[in-house]
């Protein structure tokens, strides 16, 4: 095998990786909260909005104590992939009224993409199971009207906010177990 190589190149320790993932998730949560508030200011929401294609909320805060690391990361990755797809769809098909949310919506998409990559790297470093992704969902139908696009935006940002809030709590709890 030849001589031993020199000191290997340094990359982040999984615990440091988890720390930076928490920071990134918090930052994304703040972005989402701000964007949701911006949307409410421009287009006040008349009650709660939901979208059947969005993932159901992963877990109540009270159930966090029983979490296992693989389950949290796998579920979080799957849910965030779904939200990424919905944000992409919103930017593409949301209509002219939602153009007022740019460039913030584009920034949100880029940060969501970055968080997903960070989660996957963390799972690889820990050698946690990364199950095959769900089969591709059917394409999302364009909103039926401009107001339909706005309602969808309320639902997507609201759901993402709840998911990220759960994610921060879950990741902080998991940090104590690593």
């Amino acid at each position: 095998p030849g001589p031993p190589p020199g000191p290997p190149r340094v990359s982040p320790d999984p615990r440091a990786e988890l720390d930076s993932t928490v920071l990134l998730t918090r930052s994304l949560l703040a972005d989402t909260r701000q964007l949701a508030a911006q949307l409410r200011d421009k287009f006040p929401a008349d009650g709660d909005h939901n979208l059947d294609s969005l993932p159901t909320l992963a877990m109540s805060a009270g159930a966090l104590g029983a979490l296992q690391l693989p389950g949290v990361l796998t579920r979080l990755r799957a849910d965030l992939l779904s939200y990424l797809r919905h944000v992409q769809w919103l930017r593409r098909a949301g209509g002219s009224s939602l153009k007022t949310l740019e460039p913030e919506l584009g920034t949100l998409q880029a940060r969501l993409d970055r968080l997903l990559r960070r989660l996957q790297l963390l799972m690889s470093r820990l050698a946690l199971p990364q199950p095959p992704p769900d089969p591709p969902a059917p394409p999302l139908a364009p909103p039926s009207s401009a107001w339909g696009g706005i309602r969808a935006a309320h639902a997507i940002l609201g759901g993402l906010h709840l998911t990220l809030d759960w994610a921060v709590r879950g990741l902080l709890l998991l940090k104590t177990r690593l």
Partner: antibody
């Protein structure tokens, strides 16, 4: 400085067994998933097995499933590979690697021949 | 036959820019799984060169860069040097294996 030091390689007859060890230092061993990767003479890299940071998940390449067992002892910072029913095609340099893999040992040669 | 396909060889002259491709499928690289690149100098163990498609571990010169698009990835080496002569491997997570899969490797020759 990160170090991964493999040992236990050598010449073994077909059907025989060997146990490889990998001693880790210079990083938090218990926070990393660990792999065994092999390289047959003049060939490319082939992933063999992986074990999660806490030892609760283990996965194997189809070519070694049922014959090789990966394990770890976090209290000793050591990774193991128990190889049974060895075949000529298992002849390779075996590397232990940590993380993505981010860090690699220098390898230990396993030769299966009669 | 590797699940990830790389050209067996590549070459360039000192100072040149060389690109090595790595082609996968919708079940690995195309399924949001990151690509990592390794350099194996003659007679030594592999070393991580690029992780998460484009991130460089500390100590890796910025002459090395990575990118990913769709189901393929590429490694670019600019300002080629004689010491870059080595085998280069791409790797990605393969969900059917529950482990990483490596490309067949590309032997880079500096002319």
């Amino acid at each position: 400085e990160v170090q991964l030091l493999e040992s236990g390689g050598g010449l073994v007859q077909p059907g025989g067994s060997l146990r490889l060890s990998c001693a880790a230092s210079g990083f938090t061993f218990s926070s990393y998933g660990m792999h065994w990767v092999r390289q047959a003479p003049g060939k490319g890299l082939e992933w063999v097995a992986v074990i999660s940071y806490d030892g609760s998940y283990k996965y194997y390449a189809d070519s070694v499933k049922g014959r090789f067992t990966i394990s770890r002892d976090n209290s000793k910072n050591t990774l193991y590979l128990q190889m049974n029913s060895l075949r000529a095609e298992d002849t390779a340099v075996y590397y232990c690697a940590a993380g993505v893999p981010d860090y690699w040992g220098q390898g230990t040669l396993v030769t299966v021949s009669s | 036959q590797s699940v990830l396909t790389q050209p067996p060889s590549a070459s360039g002259t000192p100072g040149q820019r060389v690109t090595i491709s790595c082609s996968g499928s919708s079940s690995n690289i195309g399924s949001y799984y990151d690509v990592h690149w390794y350099q194996q100098l003659p007679g030594t163990a592999p070393k991580l060169l690029i992780y998460s498609n484009e991130e460089r571990p500390s100590g890796v010169p910025d002459r090395f860069s990575g990118s990913k698009s769709g189901t393929s990835a590429s490694l670019a080496i600019s300002g080629l040097r004689s010491e870059d002569e080595a085998d280069y491997y791409c790797a990605a997570w393969d969900p059917s294996l529950y482990g990483p899969v490596f490309g067949g490797g590309t032997k880079l020759t500096v002319l």
